[in-house]
Amino acid sequence: FERTRSLQDPCSNCPAGTFCDNNRNQICSPCPPNSFSSAGGQRTCDICRQCKGVFRTRKECSSTSNAECDCTPGFHCLGAGCSMCEQDCKQGQELTKKGCKDCCFGTFNDQKRGICRPWTNCSLDGKSVLVNGTKERDVVCGPSPADLSPGASSVTPPAPAREPGHSPQ
């Protein structure tokens, strides 16, 4: 019975971008301006999201798909679907309640967002510091001090050549 009823339901014939208008004998009517339906058989169209202020339109709303927002230059999105915008900082900084502040010694941030993270402690892996860390970059760990004893080579062999047109996975 349910299956029969759904087959006879005139609304199931209404495509995306339309809605089944109960006020007009269940005729498929186009979605009104600033609304959309992304699937067929809808009894109403959804209101489009509006991107204003700190948000800017990344994708315009159409009759079949919602608008998508991102943040204006100098900001980055937070939350799924960009529900909030947070100020960018420079690499080597983090955003605090007092604004963008340089990373403390021993920490780094290689992005315009997020927090400063501690440099890697090479000695925990039995390695030595090959390249010192900065505010913007983590330290680079090299071979352990024992590996650098006289006679031991500290030069790593070259990576095998890749065929042209193949990128690393």
């Epitope: 959804d46 209101i47 489009c48 999201r49 509006q50 204003k52 202020g53 700190v54 948000f55 919602n66 943040c71 204006t72 100098g74 937070l78 939350g79 799924a80 679907g81 960009c82 529900s83 909030m84 915008c85 947070e86 100020q87 007092k98 604004g99």
Partner: antibody, heavy 115, light 107 residues
């Protein structure tokens, strides 16, 4: 530190114009906009309107005929003007920075409309 | 305009109990709902944005869920400082709107 502070007369006569300012610090007025929101005593929150970083404005249709929001970047201030006030406009008025979700609010200022 | 309806209007619970607050939207608002806490004489304070993201510095006992038209704020174990009024707000479409609030009081 991000700070917003509303100020203005606490008492306004009916039919006159309510004028409030929102003085901000800790962020640039050319980077962020500001929203004005009000709360009548013992009631919920009502969005009045906003001014964006570029200077354009959006208003709640319920206020559009009598509201003006503006910015004075030299003074680090946003302003709200609401004309032809009645007792129904008695409320705490807040400004809040535009970041998409109202993370930073002023402490609010109570405006009473009475003769 | 999008209407947000919060329930219950008042919730009476004891410290340590779990609080569940509801917010229903008259239209689909995706996940663009925020939750605010307001104490007497203070401005609202952002707790949750994007329906489920805890704002900076908000304790882990606060969590949000939902999408579309039905949203929930849960406080897993009530602390004495949690008794306040809670508002949901939508940032999906203009005019921006708020629920009428849920008062969380000590039983």
């Amino acid at each position: 530190q991000v700070q917003l502070q509303e100020s203005g007369p606490g008492l306004v006569k009916p039919s006159e114009t309510l004028s409030l300012t929102c003085t901000v610090s800790g962020f640039s007025l050319t980077t962020y906009g500001v929203h004005w929101i009000r709360q009548p005593p013992g009631k919920g929150l009502e969005w009045i309107g906003a001014i964006w970083s570029g200077g354009s404005t959006d208003y709640n249709a319920a206020f559009i005929s009598r509201v003006t929001i503006s910015v004075d970047t030299s003074k680090n201030q946003f302003s709200l003007k609401l004309s032809s006030v009645t007792a129904a406009d008695t409320a705490v008025y807040y400004c809040a920075r535009d970041d998409g979700s109202f993370a930073n609010w002023g402490q609010g200022t109570l405006v009473t409309v009475s003769s | 305009e999008i209407v947000l309806t919060q329930s219950p209007a008042t919730l009476s619970l004891s410290p340590g109990e779990r609080a569940t607050l509801s917010c229903k939207a008259s239209e689909n608002v995706g996940t663009y709902v925020s939750w605010y806490q307001q104490k007497p004489g203070q401005a609202p304070r952002l707790l949750i944005y994007g329906a489920s993201n805890r704002y900076t510095g908000i304790p882990a006992r606060f969590s949000g869920s939902g999408s579309g038209t039905d949203f929930t704020l849960t406080i897993s174990s009530l602390e004495p400082e949690d008794f306040a009024v809670y508002y949901c707000g939508q940032t999906y479409s203009y005019p921006l709107t708020f629920g009428q609030g849920t008062r969380l009081e000590i039983k």
